[in-house]
């Protein structure tokens, strides 16, 4: 055993190159200087080391940097990153977006591993907030990232970051998350003109209040039914038949197919049947003529 710890004559590594793939594990341990490895980490990726050999290289780096690797090494880890444990990564201080991208690239096509989850957490915490470039990067690799954040976490996302969000990034967001994201999107896109604004804001409308829907109804936006069906029920209920007709434009005919689904079903129940009949769609379930509608929620608010 003692003999194996000494590097055989003439085998001392002068640089990290392909000759090392022929080294046994104990030879790598004995003949490769950790400091040399650290300065030439960028070469490791180009060399077809076995998993066992990579374990040895990792062990050497761990011994050299017991408190955690410096970013200059982390950025060039390449496939060695897949050998890291969440505990290893918690020791790192990753501040460069280029480092984050390099490591996410290694994991590309794989599922979100505990290692990647830990890396992202460390990076975002280090940055202090989820800026646009970071969000852009994270959603490019993991489209569901944004919808994994709690409403509390989303509240710290600056409105400028919303420009990085694509419709597919919001696919699994729930109403509580959209309630937080919508005002940020409204602020981010406020200087756009009508039609461009609607294209950008459309994916966030699940968090829009009634007054914003009323405003949109005055802008000939022709909202499609899929978007309408994702609106908050409490935001849709106060809309008049005329406002819904203006909001949907030619898509208003689609209400018939959705009359048994929320929010259309609940909205129909709040409208006068006379008003619904003006649409000519055969929508049924409105308030019959001659009935008095009491808004009990308003009464409670006043008392």
């Amino acid at each position: 055993e003692v003999e194996k710890t000494a590097c055989p004559s003439g085998k001392k590594a002068r640089e990290i190159d392909e000759s090392l793939i022929f080294y046994k594990k104990w030879e790598l341990e004995a003949c490769v200087d950790a400091a040399l490895l650290a300065t030439q980490m960028d070469r490791v990726n180009a060399i077809p080391f076995t998993y066992e050999q990579l374990d040895v290289l990792k062990h050497k780096l761990d011994e050299l940097y017991p408190q955690g690797y410096p970013e200059s090494v982390i950025q060039h880890l390449g496939y060695l990153f897949l050998k890291m444990s969440p505990e290893d990564i918690r020791k790192w201080n990753v501040t460069s977006l280029e480092t984050l991208k390099a490591l996410l690239e290694v994991n590309k096509g794989h599922e979100m591993s505990p290692q990647v989850a830990t890396l992202i957490d460390r990076f975002v915490k280090g940055r202090g907030q989820l800026d646009k470039d970071t969000l852009d990067t994270l959603t490019a690799f993991y489209p569901g990232y944004l919808c994994s954040l709690s409403p509390e976490e989303l509240s710290s996302v600056p409105p400028s970051s919303i420009w990085a969000v694509r419709p597919q990034d919001l696919d699994t967001c729930d109403p509580r998350q959209l309630d937080v994201l919508y005002p940020k999107a409204r602020l981010a896109f406020q200087n756009m003109n009508g039609s461009e604004y609607f294209v950008k804001i459309q994916s966030f409308l699940g968090g829009a209040p009634t007054e914003d829907l009323k405003a949109l109804s005055q802008q000939n936006v022709s909202m499609d039914l899929a978007t309408f069906m994702k609106l908050r029920t409490d935001a849709v209920l106060p809309l008049t038949v005329a406002e819904v007709q203006k909001l949907l434009g030619p898509h208003v005919e689609g209400l018939k197919a959705e009359e048994r689904h929320r929010p259309v079903r609940d909205w129909i129940l709040r409208q006068r049947q006379d008003d619904l009949d003006t649409l000519g769609l055969g929508l049924q379930g409105g308030i019959p003529n001659g009935y008095l509608v009491l808004d009990l929620s308003m009464q409670e608010a006043l008392s």
Epitope: M112, Y142, P143, G144, C147, S148, L149, S150, E153, T172
Partner: nanobody, 111 residues
Framework: QLQLVESGGGLVQAGGSLRLSCTAS????????AKWFRRAPGKEREWVAS???????GYDDSVKGRFTISRDLAKNTVYLQMNSLRLEDTAVYYC?????WGQGTQVTVSS
């Protein structure tokens, strides 16, 4: 693509309970949270509950106080404990995490 498998659905009487599970494949971390959605016959898909990345939770008003979402990171699994089940809870329940969806598990509540 992340693989999610739901289980635990079945037939239960109104007022009864069920516990749904959603397990992620391989080494995937459930530390990024998950959500349960459901689709009742002839209806649109609707959100039920979420456990977010930071461990906090959220519920649709229709299930608040009756359903509880939780996760076990060691088992890469998210659970939905459903108590005081009602007829209107009948639906196919789907789990989603990081934009991936499971195949769903049927929950039927009978009178």
């Amino acid at each position: 693509q992340l693989q999610l498998v739901e289980s635990g659905g079945g037939l239960v009487q109104a007022g009864g309970s069920l516990r749904l599970s959603c397990t992620a494949s391989g080494s995937t971390s459930m530390s990024y949270g998950a959500k349960w959605f459901r689709r009742a016959p002839g209806k649109e898909r609707e959100w039920v509950a979420s456990v977010y990345r930071d461990g906090t939770t959220g519920y649709d008003d229709s299930v608040k106080g009756r359903f509880t979402i939780s996760r076990d990171l060691a088992k890469n699994t998210v659970y939905l404990q459903m108590n005081s089940l009602r007829l209107e809870d009948t639906a196919v329940y789907y789990c989603t995490a990081l934009n991936s969806w499971g195949q769903g598990t049927q929950v039927t509540v009978s009178s």
